[in-house]
C-alpha cells in the first residue's frame, strides 16, 4: 500500500512538475525591467526565451518573437536545449510511469517490468529536472551578469548616433516557476526510485516444503532454486505476492539490479 | 465613435472647489487610462497626471499633487477631476483625454474652462 | 522629469511650401525592448482640443494626411509637413511617452507667410 501510494504521489509530484517546467518555458517574463530607479514607468519590458514583449502605461503589449538563431547568444540556445530536453524526458517519463503505476492493471505485466518501469521513469523525472534548474541557474546567472555589466550602450537610430542608458533587467516570474518545477520533479523522480525498491521482487529465503509420496526422492538442483520435486522439471515461473506459506514451485527469482538501488 | 463629453464652464471664487467631469462613450471606460491636461490661456499643454483604469489608482505630476483629486464612477463611464482651494492661477481650459497605444493621447474631451475670480 | 524643447517657437510658411518642425528631448526616448520612440505629435487649433497626428516619433494615426511625417530618433525628432495647407494653419506640440510624467513641448506656431 505505502509502495502505491509512494508510486502515485511521485507520479503527481511530477506531473505538476513537468507541467511547470512546460509553463516556465513558454512564459515570457524569465527577465523583468528592473523598476529600482523607476518604479512608475511608462513602458514597461519583459522578456522570455522565445520573445520580447513590452508593455505600455496604455496597456498595449506588443511582443516580437526572436526571428533568427545564429543572432541569439549562445548561453540563450543552451538554455532553450536544457529546458526543451528537460520537457522531453519529463514527457517520456509521463508515459513510462503510466504503465508503471501498481494500481493501474495491463495485462499480465509482471511486478518486476513494472520495477523496471517505474526506475527508468524514476531517472527520467530526476533528469528532467535538473536539466529545467540548470537551464533556470543559466538564465539567472546570465542575468546578473548583465545586471551589472549594462552602463551604456550605443544605438544607431535615424538620428545618428544616440547615447541611451540600457535597460537593466532582472529576475522574471519564470525563473521562480521553474525553479519550483524543476525541484517538483527532482522529488517526484526521487519518490519513483524509492517506490521502485518496494515494487521489485525480494530475494527472501524460505524453507522449501515439499510435499511428495513415498519412493519418491527430492532432487536438489543447481540455479537458484531451493528444491524441486521428482515430477519433472519446475515451469512455473511467477511470483505471487499472498503472504501466506510458498510450496516449492513458487520459484524463488534471482536479485535484480533494483534491489540495490 | 469614441467621444468624451465634458461639463460646462465654471468660474468660481479663490478658495472654492470645483469638480469638472468627463463623460465616455464608444468604448469601456475602465480599458483605457483617462488622463488630464491642463492649458491656461495662450500658454501651452500641461499634464496634470493620469487615473489607471483596471485600479482606479491616480498618479499625478508634482505640481499636481495635493489640491487635484481624479476619481472614476464606472457605472456611468465618467471620470472626474476635483480642484479644492482654487486659487487664480488655477484659471484654464481642463481636458480629460484617453491614454492609447505609444502612450498617446488620441480622443479628447472638448475642455472645460474653470475660471477663478474674485 | 524630460524636459521637451521645441524650435522654433513660432514658423511662417508658404502654402504648399514645406514645413519643419523640431524637438529635442533632455533624455532618450528610445526604447530598447522594442526600438521604438516614444515620441508624439499633436496639432491644437484655436479654440479647440489638441488632435493626435504622429506616435512612436513616425507612425501616422489613422485619417491624418499623409503630407505630415514625423522622423528621428533617441532626442532629436522632426515633424514635417511637405506642402503647407491652409487648414494645417495650428500650434504643434511634441510629447514624451517614455516615461512619468508626461510632458509637452512649448508649441510650435504655424503661420501663413
Known amino acids: 500500500m505505502a509502495v502505491t501510494a509512494c508510486q502515485g504521489l511521485g507520479f503527481v509530484v511530477s506531473l505538476i512538475g513537468i507541467a511547470g517546467i512546460i509553463a516556465a518555458t513558454c512564459m515570457d517574463q524569465w527577465s523583468t525591467q528592473d523598476l529600482y530607479n523607476n518604479p512608475v514607468t511608462a513602458v514597461f519590458n519583459y522578456q522570455g526565451l522565445w520573445r520580447s514583449c513590452v508593455r505600455e502605461s496604455s496597456g498595449f503589449t506588443e511582443c516580437r518573437g526572436y526571428f533568427t538563431l545564429l543572432g541569439l547568444p549562445a548561453m540563450l540556445q543552451a538554455v532553450r536545449a536544457l529546458m526543451i530536453v528537460g520537457i522531453v524526458l519529463g514527457a517520456i517519463g509521463l508515459l513510462v510511469s503510466i504503465f508503471a503505476l501498481k494500481c493501474i492493471r495491463i495485462g499480465s505485466m509482471e511486478d518486476s517490468a513494472k520495477a523496471n518501469m517505474t526506475l527508468t521513469s524514476g531517472i527520467m523525472f530526476i533528469v528532467s529536472g535538473l536539466c529545467a534548474i540548470a537551464g533556470v541557474s543559466v538564465f539567472a546567472n546570465m542575468l546578473v551578469t548583465n545586471f551589472w555589466m549594462s552602463t551604456a550602450n550605443m544605438y544607431t537610430g535615424m538620428g545618428g548616433m544616440v547615447q541611451t542608458v540600457q535597460t537593466r533587467y532582472t529576475f522574471g516570474a519564470a525563473l521562480f516557476v521553474g525553479w519550483v518545477a524543476g525541484g517538483l520533479t527532482l522529488i517526484g523522480g526521487v519518490m519513483m526510485c524509492i517506490a521502485c525498491r518496494g515494487l521489485a521482487p525480494e530475494e527472501t529465503n524460505y524453507k522449501a516444503v515439499s510435499y511428495h509420496a513415498s519412493g519418491h526422492s527430492v532432487a536438489y538442483k543447481p540455479g537458484g532454486f531451493k528444491a524441486s520435486t521428482g515430477f519433472g522439471s519446475n515451469t512455473k515461473n511467477k511470483k505471487i505476492y499472498d503472504g501466506g506459506a510458498r510450496t516449492e514451485d513458487e520459484v524463488q527469482s534471482y536479485p535484480s539490479k533494483h534491489d540495490y538501488v | 465613435q469614441i467621444q468624451l463629453v465634458q461639463s460646462g464652464s465654471e468660474l468660481k471664487k479663490p478658495g472654492a472647489s470645483v469638480k469638472v467631469s468627463c463623460k465616455a462613450s464608444?468604448?469601456?471606460?475602465?480599458?483605457?487610462?483617462m488622463n488630464w491636461v491642463r492649458q491656461a490661456p495662450g500658454q501651452g499643454l500641461e499634464w496634470m497626471g493620469w487615473i489607471r483604469p483596471n485600479t482606479g489608482e491616480p498618479t499625478y505630476a508634482e505640481d499636481f499633487k495635493g489640491r487635484f483629486v481624479f476619481s472614476l464612477d464606472t457605472s456611468v463611464a465618467t471620470a472626474y477631476l476635483q480642484i479644492t482651494s482654487l486659487k487664480a492661477e488655477d484659471t484654464a481650459v481642463y481636458y480629460c483625454a484617453r491614454l492609447y497605444r505609444g502612450n498617446t493621447l488620441d480622443n479628447w474631451g472638448q475642455g472645460t474652462l474653470v475660471t477663478v475670480s474674485s | 522629469d524630460i524636459v521637451m524643447t521645441q524650435s522654433p517657437d513660432s514658423l511662417a510658411v508658404s502654402l504648399g511650401e514645406r514645413a519643419t518642425i523640431n524637438c529635442k528631448s533632455s533624455q532618450n526616448l528610445l526604447n530598447s525592448g522594442n526600438q521604438r520612440n516614444y515620441l508624439t505629435w499633436y496639432q491644437q487649433k484655436p479654440g479647440q482640443p489638441p488632435k493626435l497626428l504622429i506616435y512612436w516619433a513616425s507612425t501616422r494615426e489613422s485619417g491624418v494626411p499623409d503630407r505630415f511625417s514625423g522622423s528621428g530618433s533617441g532626442t532629436d525628432f522632426t515633424l514635417t509637413i511637405s506642402s503647407l495647407q491652409a487648414e494645417d494653419l495650428a500650434v504643434y506640440y511634441c510629447?514624451?511617452?517614455?516615461?512619468?510624467?508626461?510632458?509637452f513641448g512649448q508649441g510650435t506656431k504655424l503661420e501663413i507667410k
Open positions: 464608444g468604448y469601456t471606460l475602465t480599458n483605457y487610462g
Open positions: 510629447q514624451n511617452g517614455y516615461s512619468f510624467p508626461f510632458t
